[in-house]
């Protein structure tokens, strides 16, 4: 079995995480994707999740996560905006595959959020206006249920995670058509 | 129907094990984790862990480390709680709840509870 | 870990009024994505608990809606709008932000 392997980032309160977990094009583009964060015991819990099937390009915010999956690159785009102490933690990207369970993607993301002004570009990012917010009525709840397995048979392509800008081929250039996604209703 | 169905009351001397177990049915045993919790004679509710029937993987409390063990059985969808070295003070109504999938952490079913008496 | 405070610890109340629950949290219980972990559970007497709210706001299937969930980060409540005779038992407000999951130390409702 594969060790999971972990990436350490350190950052302020109110920067902005940014993931980007690599997979495999053919196999995956369309899959549901998610982001988990992974408690004690290897507990993880679906913090947010792309729509089913998921859409190119087209972002999908709950709360301070902002997911975007880019069919073309292959590639999930998760980012944490205004980050909080609270949010340190262990995360990582998983694919849905059912009726098989989750297909995990490297690296893990060790997240450790300190306190402290920071004047990096982008630490205020505010991508959370102009959102467009699906009605209170909405009954379905987005995430499927999951566990994950504790053994990894063979090593999906490494996540990479930054709190640069956006690279300029995937640069998101208008924050209008955010999805305001409810899990639950 | 979603259903938690627990073992029978226990009555133990101190110092020794008690194992219960909870036979879960109406859905997918491997999708949901479960939890362990415990509640003393008159007094509140107390998180003991948790185990993800699906890889099997467990999350004690500190309290509890060491003493306590949980495992799973897919074939039977049945968790068990082991509880060793008892004392007096364990005696209380021990029940296994299953965490919501999904989002939410919430303990949407519960079983209907097994007293474990410790007592010389 | 996150400890949990109820308040009061007795509630007597009167058919056809209303109720109100407070639980605090020693740490924020909202997460990244917006929910707040925070449930509220019924334990009638004798009985299992029962998941009345979760995420802090959200009703579980089958609680009348005389039930309500609110607050935010550290403070929440649990609001009864009239308190029905069937509704007397011990309320638990728990947080399940992190691993341990915590309990309040419970609100015993009955009626006077």
């Known amino acids: 079995a594969t060790k999971l392997t972990e990436e350490k980032y350190e950052l302020k309160e109110g920067q902005t995480l940014d993931v980007k977990c690599d997979y495999t094009l053919e196999k995956f583009a369309s899959s549901q994707k998610a982001w988990q964060i992974i408690r004690d015991g290897e507990m993880p819990k679906t913090l947010a999740c792309t729509e089913r099937p998921s859409k190119n390009s087209h972002p999908v915010q709950v709360g301070r996560i902002i997911l975007e999956d880019y069919h073309d690159h292959g590639l999930l785009r998760v980012r944490m905006v205004n980050l909080q102490v609270e949010d340190s933690g262990l995360y990582q990207c998983v694919i849905y595959q059912p009726p098989k369970e989750p297909h995990m993607l490297f690296d893990r993301i060790r997240l450790v959020v300190t306190k402290g002004f920071s004047g990096t570009p982008g630490s205020n990012e505010n991508s959370t206006q102009n959102v467009y917010k699906i009605p209170p009525t909405t009954t379905k709840a987005l995430c499927p249920l999951y566990t994950s397995p504790r053994t990894v048979t063979q090593a999906p392509p490494k996540s990479t995670a930054d709190v640069s800008t956006p690279d300029s081929e995937i640069n998101l250039t208008n924050v209008t058509d955010i999805i305001r996604v409810p899990v639950f209703n | 129907q979603v259903q938690l169905v627990q073992s029978g009351a226990e009555v133990k001397k101190p110092g020794a094990s008690v194992k219960v177990s909870c036979k879960a049915s109406?859905?997918?045993?491997?999708?949901?984790?479960m939890h362990w919790v415990r509640q003393a004679p008159g007094q509140g509710l107390e998180w003991m862990g948790v185990i993800n029937p699906g890889g099997g993987s467990t999350s004690y409390a500190q309290k509890f480390q060491g003493r306590v063990t949980m495992t799973r059985d897919t074939s039977t969808s049945t968790v068990y709680m082991e509880l060793s070295s008892l004392r007096s003070e364990d005696t209380a109504v021990y029940y296994c709840?299953?965490?919501?999938?999904?989002?939410?952490?919430?303990?949407?079913?519960w079983g209907q509870g097994t007293m474990v008496t410790v007592s010389s | 870990d996150i400890v949990m405070t109820q308040s009061p610890l007795s509630l007597p109340v009167t058919p056809g009024e209303p109720a109100s629950i407070s639980c605090r949290s020693s740490?924020?219980?909202?997460?990244?994505?917006?929910?707040?972990?925070l449930d509220w559970y019924l334990q009638k007497p004798g009985q299992s608990p029962q998941l009345l709210i979760y995420?802090?706001?959200h009703r579980a299937s089958g609680v009348p809606d005389r039930f309500s969930g609110s607050g935010s980060g550290t403070d929440f409540t649990l609001k009864i709008s009239r308190v029905e005779a069937e509704d007397v038992g011990v309320y638990y407000c728990m947080q399940g932000r992190q691993v341990p999951f915590t309990f309040g130390g419970g609100t015993k409702v009955e009626i006077k």
């Open positions: 740490q924020s219980l909202l997460h990244s994505n917006g929910y707040n972990y």
């Open positions: 995420l802090g706001s």
């Open positions: 109406g859905y997918t045993f491997t999708s949901y984790y």
């Open positions: 709840a299953r965490e919501a999938g999904q989002t939410s952490s919430a303990l949407d079913v």
